[in-house]
């Protein structure tokens, strides 16, 4: 049980009559320390504290009465010096002074910790006039004190351009401990020590701290606030709080969860956003990060073709934005794709594998061994070629596109022919005699037109010339052939 020491403060006699006492609280304060008992004229020394002068400012009036007697110095009368009370209680305290009636318009202002208290404070000034002097009592009341009301209160009065200041009244609001620093949630490495801090203040002091981990007290004896707990390491999540105790009771901090960093969970929902012949754009939903930020992710790609050698391509990327374009893939191929992400602890397992396919692409190589010759009897140009390697067709051949350009004396015209995929030869009509015909062939799939072969040129003479020799695709690096017949 909490016991309260009480020392009653007796009001100081001011004047005859029913004047308010110098200490009025709507409860009995814990402890009141009056300065000295009895009415103290200015600069008189307290009998209980020899040699101690009144600390308030004193104004010595220059005005004299009709009989030319000098007026006594003006000073606030002593009042209670220290009021201790519990939070949410009410308190009332006052300053009093006797002012000769020759002074008009005397006002008393209240100050706290050096700042004037203005506005919504419960300050009341009462005047009790007599023949020669007026007793002025300024009361200050707080209905429900808070910690912010702690401080030093004084009264000030201006007379004759002199300022009279009362002794301070110290208000000390006591309550349960108040946390100024509480433990914070953290993510920590398994079996690694870390610190938690807890700090609480009164009044009343001292404030003692107990640490609690998973509802068990860590320290069986209190530690003075502030307290730092070194946790020797955790193997699993734990909840910590601290208890702050003072003579008024106990306050418990918020409970904070300390998590153990772990490898992340595998990503989920890997999905195909877009496919082209040579790339696949994937996205994924990251798994749980294991209480440690993701650093990067790894996309694993393997050919789904059972005849493939099973090698895995790995593409590393940043953890954000959970999107990656896998490039350098073969067209019209099936792939298995998995995603794994890492944090500071390590790599997650791979996500569930998904199947994805690239689309058909335009062939990546041109037809090979293109040869061209003139069939004069039918006035046609015969063209032959070999189809590109299957691997490089990047799809199913639907045919070929033949470009033939006819050039003669300043005239040039290009014509395009489409031929089906079955043959590897074509015949085109001679368009212009006495001209050069340049032929290029490209393979075509549903994915588009591939690159054209290197140009093969043949000269078409005027009628009556005979052509037996074909023109063909040159070996790489040779100049374009021109066959003159």
């Amino acid at each position: 049980a909490i016991t309260e020491a009480r020392e009653e403060a007796k009001p100081y006699p001011l004047f005859p009559g029913p004047f308010p006492g110098s200490l009025q609280t709507d409860h009995t304060p814990l402890l009141s320390l009056p300065h000295a008992s009895g009415y103290q004229p200015a600069l008189m020394f307290s009998p209980t504290q020899p040699g101690r002068p009144h600390t308030g400012n004193v104004a010595i009036p220059q005005v004299t009465s009709v009989e030319s007697k000098p007026l006594p110095p003006l000073a606030f009368k002593h009042t209670v010096g220290h009021i201790i009370l519990s939070e949410h209680k009410g308190v009332k305290f006052n300053c009093s002074i006797s002012v000769p009636n020759i002074y008009q318009d005397t006002t008393i202002s209240w100050w706290k910790d050096g700042k004037e208290l203005l506005g919504a404070h419960h300050a009341i000034t009462q005047f009790y006039p007599d023949d020669e002097v007026t007793a002025i009592i300024a009361s200050f009341s707080i209905t429900s004190v808070q910690r912010s009301d702690n401080g030093s209160y004084i009264c000030k009065m201006k007379i004759n351009n002199e300022e009279i200041v009362s002794d301070p009244i110290y208000i000390e609001v006591q309550g349960l401990p108040h946390f100024t620093k509480q433990p914070e949630s953290m993510n920590v490495t398994r079996n690694t020590a870390f610190n938690l801090t807890c700090q609480a203040v009164g009044p009343p002091e001292p404030v003692n701290i107990f640490w609690v981990q998973n509802s068990s007290r860590v320290n069986e004896q209190p530690e003075k606030s502030p307290s730092v707990l070194t946790v020797p390491g955790l193997t699993e999540m734990a909840v910590f709080s601290c208890e702050a105790h003072n003579d008024k009771g106990l306050t418990v901090s918020k409970g904070v969860q300390i998590n153990i960093k772990a490898i992340p969970s595998p990503p989920t929902e890997v999905s195909i956003r877009n496919s082209t012949a040579h790339s696949i754009l994937i996205s994924w939903v990251p798994g749980f990060d294991g209480y440690s930020p993701f650093r990067n992710c790894s996309i694993q790609v393997k050919e789904a073709d059972p005849l493939s050698n099973g090698s895995v391509m790995i593409f590393n990327t940043s953890a954000l934005p959970h999107l990656y374009q896998i490039k350098q893939l073969q067209a019209l191929a099936n792939y298995s794709i998995g995603v794994s992400c890492m944090n500071e602890i390590g790599w997650s397992a791979v996500s569930p594998w998904i199947l994805a396919s690239t689309t058909e692409g335009a062939p990546s190589v041109a037809p090979l061994n293109v040869t061209v010759f003139l069939n004069e009897s039918s006035d046609n140009v015969d063209i032959r070629w070999m189809k590109p390697p299957t691997k490089q067709q990047d799809g199913e051949l639907v045919g070929y596109r033949i470009s033939h350009v006819w050039q003669s004396a300043g005239i040039s015209k290009e014509l395009l022919e489409e031929v089906g995929q079955n043959g590897s030869r074509a015949r085109i009509s001679v368009q212009v005699h006495n001209a050069t015909c340049t032929v290029r062939i490209a393979a075509v799939t549903r994915g588009g037109v591939g690159p054209f072969s290197d140009p093969v040129k043949i000269f078409i003479p005027a009628h009556g010339w005979v052509d037996y020799a074909p023109s063909s695709t040159p070996a790489p690096g040779n100049a374009d052939p021109v066959l003159i017949i």
Epitope: N191, W211, Q213, N214, S216, V218, N219, E220, Q221, P222, E223, L229, T230, P232, G233, T235, A238
Partner: antibody, heavy 118, light 106 residues
């Protein structure tokens, strides 16, 4: 450095009482609780309980409630264990040990042998 | 109360051998402490809070575990390691010790 020095061996008759002491030095006595641990001959360690050196409040393990009394004299930084109505099975070495965070017994006294024999 | 069961009770080991002592709790505990005791001496603090070696303890010792299963391991036994080792739990009152494991050097 931290030291816990216990009083010397005791030979007692059944029914008698014994009070053994544990004097602490090298740290603030009231900062750490004091545990008492019993070790019967050839046996393991048994936690008897502890005393809060800040408040003086004792806590006894179930097997040590009744005849066992923990006390303090903080002015001389000393904890005491008194055993009343001694029985033969109380024959053991009694250790004091400081009570740190997480009930870590960081410092131990050298032990006091109490022999109960008629 | 939580019962701690150490195994083995006794082990005779040759120097340089690896030794593992286990301590199993009847319910989950937060931390396990270990103490070393030699004949006619008081116990010495050895491993704090499952895995933290006390001051002066050789690095050949290590501690691990969580929940109900904890181990003290000596990587390469030396003659001076002959002693009885006790585990002690923190997390549930009353505090309890294991029955001890006595290591003897062959």
């Amino acid at each position: 450095q931290v030291q816990l020095v216990q009083s010397g061996s005791e030979l007692k008759k059944p029914g008698a009482s014994v009070k053994i002491s544990c004097k602490a030095s090298g740290y603030t006595f009231t900062n750490y609780g004091m545990n008492w641990v019993r070790q019967a001959p050839g046996q393991g360690l048994e936690w008897m309980g502890w005393i809060n050196t800040y408040t003086g409040e004792p806590t006894y393990a179930d097997d040590f409630k009744g005849r066992f009394v923990f006390s303090l004299d903080t002015s001389v930084s000393t904890a005491y264990l008194q055993i009343n109505n001694l029985k033969a099975e109380d024959t053991a070495v009694y250790f004091c040990a400081t009570y740190g965070h997480y009930a870590w017994f960081a410092y131990w006294g050298q032990g006091t042998l109490v022999t109960v024999s008629s | 109360e939580i019962v701690l069961t150490q195994s083995p009770d006794f082990q005779s080991v040759t120097p340089k051998e690896k030794v593992t002592i286990t301590c199993r709790a009847s319910s989950s505990v937060s931390y396990m402490h270990w103490y070393q005791q030699k004949p006619d001496q008081s116990p010495k603090p050895w491993i704090k809070a499952t895995s933290n070696l006390a001051s002066g303890v050789p690095s050949r010792f290590s501690g691990s575990g969580s929940g109900t299963d904890f181990t003290l391991t000596i990587n390469s036994l030396e003659a001076e390691d002959a002693a009885t080792y006790y585990c002690q739990q923190w997390g549930t009152k009353p505090l309890t010790f294991g029955q001890g494991t006595k290591l003897e050097i062959k």
